[in-house]
């Protein structure tokens, strides 16, 4: 056991060594390891095959470290692997496409706050198993098309807290079991009418605190299982544009937040909702 | 007569906070029909608006993009009042300052108030 | 964002003269148009909204139509005190958004 941490065998073979101050992986960990702690350190790389020789590895916590680089092939034969969490590292800002190929069991993955500003081409290939994906409180820009595409299993996708401006057609495809979706708190000001064509089971969809003006009720006609929808704190405009929207808020047997118009400025600050269909005048 | 009256400093320092004030007469910050708004003006980028704030039973804020990051404004119900804060500028944010009132029945902005910052070192 | 084109930049006018300053939208924006007056180290003056409504106090001289995306600004006989640079504004969508300006001159 690697002398800044502490090694035992139930419930799971754990190497525990948070908070060590320490500056690099350690050598010597078990090679019987199923669980790894490793948070709250100094450690500001993740070599080329670091754990490679635990090839029972379901728990990976790298979490409040220094990381700044994250070699490609570092988590390698970790085919076992369920919970990665980098979280917490926010000078890392990007992570090579291969880094995490191979890791067909992980069920979750935290990315938040590691100050990425883009998620490369294939970063998430092959990750059938993700059921929860945290990417909050990043700098993404951008979600280019089918980067969640392998992830027909996934039920959380955070991604609030970036500065995402615009929802393309193809950003959430594939996304089939999606339950939850939490675009808050970034600067979308476009959806495109087929973004959330897969979304058949999402349940809840939060898009408060963005730069939405309209939002085209094509985009949320395949939600079919919605139950939860919060549109606050945008800028929405309450003229005849807004009538699709309104329509179909009237309709939703589901839970709303206010929809606040911002213009025109006669109706600024009223739930749309709440307005007659002859207030929405004006094109 | 509704009359705005700016006030703050005239120079400002790059990476620091711009601050500006505005005072409002002969009308209410908490008006329920009326919006406060902050715009500017220069040479080389025009007149821009950068944001406002309103009051309908609670308080509203709208930005403009370009400055979302970077920009509050917040009202001040007993100095009946209304302020602009601006963090971490540049050069670029060399220009007139107004605020402005947008009344309550689609009218564009019919009161100014004018002040001048310049951002320097 | 609407980008709002304003033509022509400058004018040569005289006193007497009838002048149209045009502004079109990127996109439509109804009526939810602006036209204000400035004058060196002062704030613009509104002096029409909704397109065609003249706001309180201006002279009827001055007169605005259009709808869409196509808007004219009209001064029937100009005057000394008209001579200004003269700006649009949509307030149909955010963020909102001003004309380059027209600045009218004396010839």
């Known amino acids: 056991c690697p002398g800044a941490c502490v090694c035992y065998n139930e419930p799971k073979v754990t190497t525990s060594c948070p908070q060590q101050g320490l500056q690099a992986v350690p050598v010597g960990i078990p090679a019987a390891s199923q669980r790894i702690f490793l948070h709250g350190n100094r450690i500001s790389h993740v070599p080329a095959a670091s754990f490679r020789a635990c090839r029972n590895l379901t728990i990976l916590w790298l979490h409040s470290n220094v990381l700044a680089r994250i070699d490609a092939a570092a988590f390698t034969g970790l085919a076992l692997l369920e919970q990665l969490d980098l979280s917490d590292n926010a000078q890392l800002r990007s992570v090579d496409p291969a880094t995490f190929h191979g890791l067909g069991r992980l069920h979750t993955l935290h990315l938040d706050r590691c100050g990425l500003q883009e998620l490369g081409p294939g970063l998430f290939r092959g990750l059938a198993a993700l059921q929860y994906l945290y990417l909050q409180d990043n700098a993404l820009q951008a979600l280019p098309d089918d980067t969640f595409r392998d992830l027909g299993n996934l039920t959380h996708l955070f991604l609030h807290g970036n500065r995402i401006s615009s929802v393309p057609e193809r950003a959430f495809r594939g996304l089939h079991s999606l339950d939850r979706l939490l675009l808050h708190q970034n600067r979308v000001a476009h959806v495109h009418p087929h973004a959330f064509r897969d979304l058949g089971r999402l349940m809840t969809l939060y898009l408060f605190a963005n730069n939405l003006s309209a939002l085209p009720t094509e985009a949320l006609a395949p939600l079919r299982a919605l139950q939860y929808l919060r549109l606050n704190d945008n800028p929405w405009v309450c003229d005849c544009r807004a009538r699709p929207l309104w329509a179909w808020l009237q309709k939703f047997r589901g839970s709303s937040s206010e929809v606040p118009c911002s213009l025109p400025q006669r109706l600024a600050g009223r739930d749309l909702k709440r307005l007659a269909a002859n207030d929405l005048q004006g094109c | 007569q509704v009359q705005l009256q700016q006030s703050g400093p005239g120079l400002v320092k790059p990476s620091q906070t711009l601050s500006l004030t505005c005072a409002i007469s002969g009308d209410s910050v908490s008006s329920n029909s009326a919006a406060w708004n902050w715009i500017r003006q220069s040479p080389s980028r025009g007149l821009e608006w950068l944001?406002?704030?309103?009051?309908?039973?609670?308080?509203?804020?709208d930005f403009a993009p370009f400055v979302q990051s970077r920009i509050a404004v917040n009202p001040d119900t007993s100095k009946n009042q209304f302020s602009l804060h601006l963090k971490f500028v540049t050069s670029e944010d060399t220009a007139v300052y107004y605020c402005a009132r947008d009344p309550p029945d689609d009218q564009g902005f019919d009161i100014w108030g004018r002040t001048m910052v310049t951002v320097s070192s | 964002d609407v980008v709002m084109t304003q033509s022509p930049s400058s004018l040569s006018a005289s006193v007497g003269d009838r002048v149209a300053i045009t502004c079109r939208a990127s996109q439509g924006i109804s009526n939810y148009l602006a036209w204000y007056q400035q004058k060196p180290g002062k704030a613009p003056k509104l002096l029409i909204y909704?397109?065609?409504t003249l706001e309180s106090g201006v002279p009827s001289r001055f007169s605005g139509s259009g709808s869409g995306t196509e808007f004219t600004l009209t001064i029937s006989s100009l005057q000394p005190d008209d001579f200004a640079t003269y700006y649009c504004?949509?307030?149909?969508?955010?963020?909102?958004?001003f004309g380059g300006g027209t600045k009218l001159e004396i010839k």
């Open positions: 504004q949509q307030y149909s969508n955010y963020p909102l958004t």
């Open positions: 944001g406002r704030t309103y009051y309908r039973s609670q308080w509203h804020n």
């Open positions: 909704k397109a065609s």
